[in-house]
Interface confidence: medium
């Protein structure tokens, strides 16, 4: 029998895919835990196998079917449990009625790009992927620029209130190394969250030119 | 084997609350959902509500408000609170669970318990 | 809400006849369910999935559809099968019924 204190949170995609994350004090030893996904009235269930991520969690991601199929809508509750193994049989650790729609995170934006960039302004460009059409246009962004002698945790947000995939970042400092990153977060759902960062895109603005006053 | 039954009905005023049970045996009320469904004198069923396995609920919105599901799995035993009687919600009331799968419809019913509402 | 429609609301048929009723959903559900309610009993479970017949169910009643409109037939009518069938969606909620068919024998 494992003790302690459980918790286990779980997001979807909005497409194909929850991942879930389950934290147990009084960690359990070499044993097998699986999450079980039980739609209320579709004709599929799913099983992931939960994998250490740190001494007290472990993490898997039930992947529903082809990447952008849309595996389920607002009005699905999908049971979803913890199950270990206790000898020969399974022992359900944790279980939740999980809303889909209420607990969304969107894959990491993609595909970005410097569209144009000047000495003291770039233009950047990037894509969602795995997004439902049910959103329309019902997202919002997060960006922030990491300056040369800064960490990420530093950097000011910026916030698109928008589905807006493009952003034109100012008073930038010619000649000067910067990375950035986007977020994006759907409005619907009561415990939706932000997807993870993009991956960082390096870009460099212009050199002042010669002579001109920066 | 598979069973449930319901009790608590009988004739209460307009007005008045009521709380019906739903004995489950044969499987665990935390591996499945359990919906409540009522049918008024000859007419069709109406679907009031689920407590899903997890212990949430879902309602019928002609009924939410007024309506509770909950349930004690030291019983094995789900409940249907009613409030704010009102003589329309005179009825046959079943509880039934599906299949193996959500998707196998009520496969489950109880043999209903009658509501009188009336002054 | 998504409404189901019956029909007919009532019929009348000799043993062995062949009797079909339709259910029309107000908007397209992915699959149909329908039950069989004797008088003073609760309803059971004939057909799941549309088209799938529920344990111990004859198989002299069958379901088709997609869409909007759905069939459910009886191919030779028993006398055991006096009552009233319900058609029943579970694409979205609320869950909903249609009204009944009341089958009778000549």
């Known amino acids: 029998a494992v003790n302690g204190t459980s918790q286990f949170t779980c997001f979807y995609n909005s497409r194909a895919n929850i991942s879930c994350v389950w934290s147990q004090d009084g960690a359990l030893q070499d044993t097998s835990c699986q999450v079980h996904a039980w739609p209320d009235r579709r004709r599929w269930n799913q099983t992931c196998e939960l994998l250490p991520v740190s001494q007290a969690s472990w993490a898997c991601n039930l992947i529903l079917g082809a990447p952008d199929s849309q595996k389920l809508t607002t009005v699905d509750i999908v049971t979803l449990r913890v199950l270990c193994r206790e000898g020969v049989r399974w022992r359900v650790m944790a279980i939740q009625d999980f809303k889909p729609f209420e607990n969304l995170r969107l894959m990491a934006p993609i595909s970005l790009q410097v569209v144009h960039v000047e000495t003291h302004r770039c233009n950047i460009s990037w894509e969602i992927s795995q997004a439902s059409h049910y959103f329309e246009r019902h997202l919002e962004f997060e960006a922030r620029t990491l300056s040369p002698g800064h960490t990420w945790e530093e950097a000011p947000l910026l916030t698109l209130k928008q589905k807006q995939e493009w952003i034109c970042l100012e008073t930038l400092t010619p000649d000067t190394q910067y990375e950035f990153q986007v977020r994006v977060k759907p409005l619907q759902g009561e415990f939706t969250t932000w997807s993870p960062w993009s991956q960082p895109l390096a870009f460099r603005t212009k050199p002042a030119a010669l002579g001109k006053d920066t | 084997e598979v069973q449930l039954l319901e009790s608590g009905g009988g004739l209460v005023q307009p007005g008045g609350s009521l709380r019906l049970s739903c004995a489950a045996s044969g499987f665990s009320v935390t591996s499945y959902g359990v919906h409540w469904i009522r049918q008024a004198p000859g007419k069709g069923l109406e679907w009031l509500g689920a407590i899903w396995s997890g212990g949430s609920t879902q309602y019928n919105a002609a009924v939410k408000g007024r309506f509770t599901i909950s349930r004690d799995n030291s019983k094995n035993t789900l409940y249907l609170q009613m409030n704010s009687l009102r003589a329309e919600d005179t009825a046959v009331y079943y509880c039934?669970?599906?299949?193996?799968?959500?998707?196998?419809?009520?496969?489950?019913w109880g043999q209903g318990t009658l509501v009188t509402v009336s002054s | 809400d998504i409404q189901m429609t019956q029909s007919p609301s009532s019929l009348s048929a000799s043993v062995g006849d062949r009797v079909t009723i339709t259910c029309q959903a107000s908007s397209s559900v992915s699959f149909m369910y329908w039950y069989q309610q004797r008088p003073g009993k609760a309803p059971r479970l004939l057909i799941y999935?549309?088209?799938n017949l529920a344990s111990g169910v004859p198989s002299r009643f069958s379901g088709s559809g997609s869409g909007t409109s759905y069939t459910f037939t009886i191919s030779s009518l028993q006398p055991e099968d006096i009552a009233t069938y319900y058609c029943?969606?579970?694409?979205?909620?609320?869950?909903?019924f249609g009204q009944g068919t009341k089958v009778e024998i000549k």
């Open positions: 029943q969606q579970w694409s979205t909620y609320p869950l909903t």
């Open positions: 039934a669970r599906a299949g193996d799968a959500n998707y196998d419809g009520f496969a489950y």
């Open positions: 999935d549309t088209s």
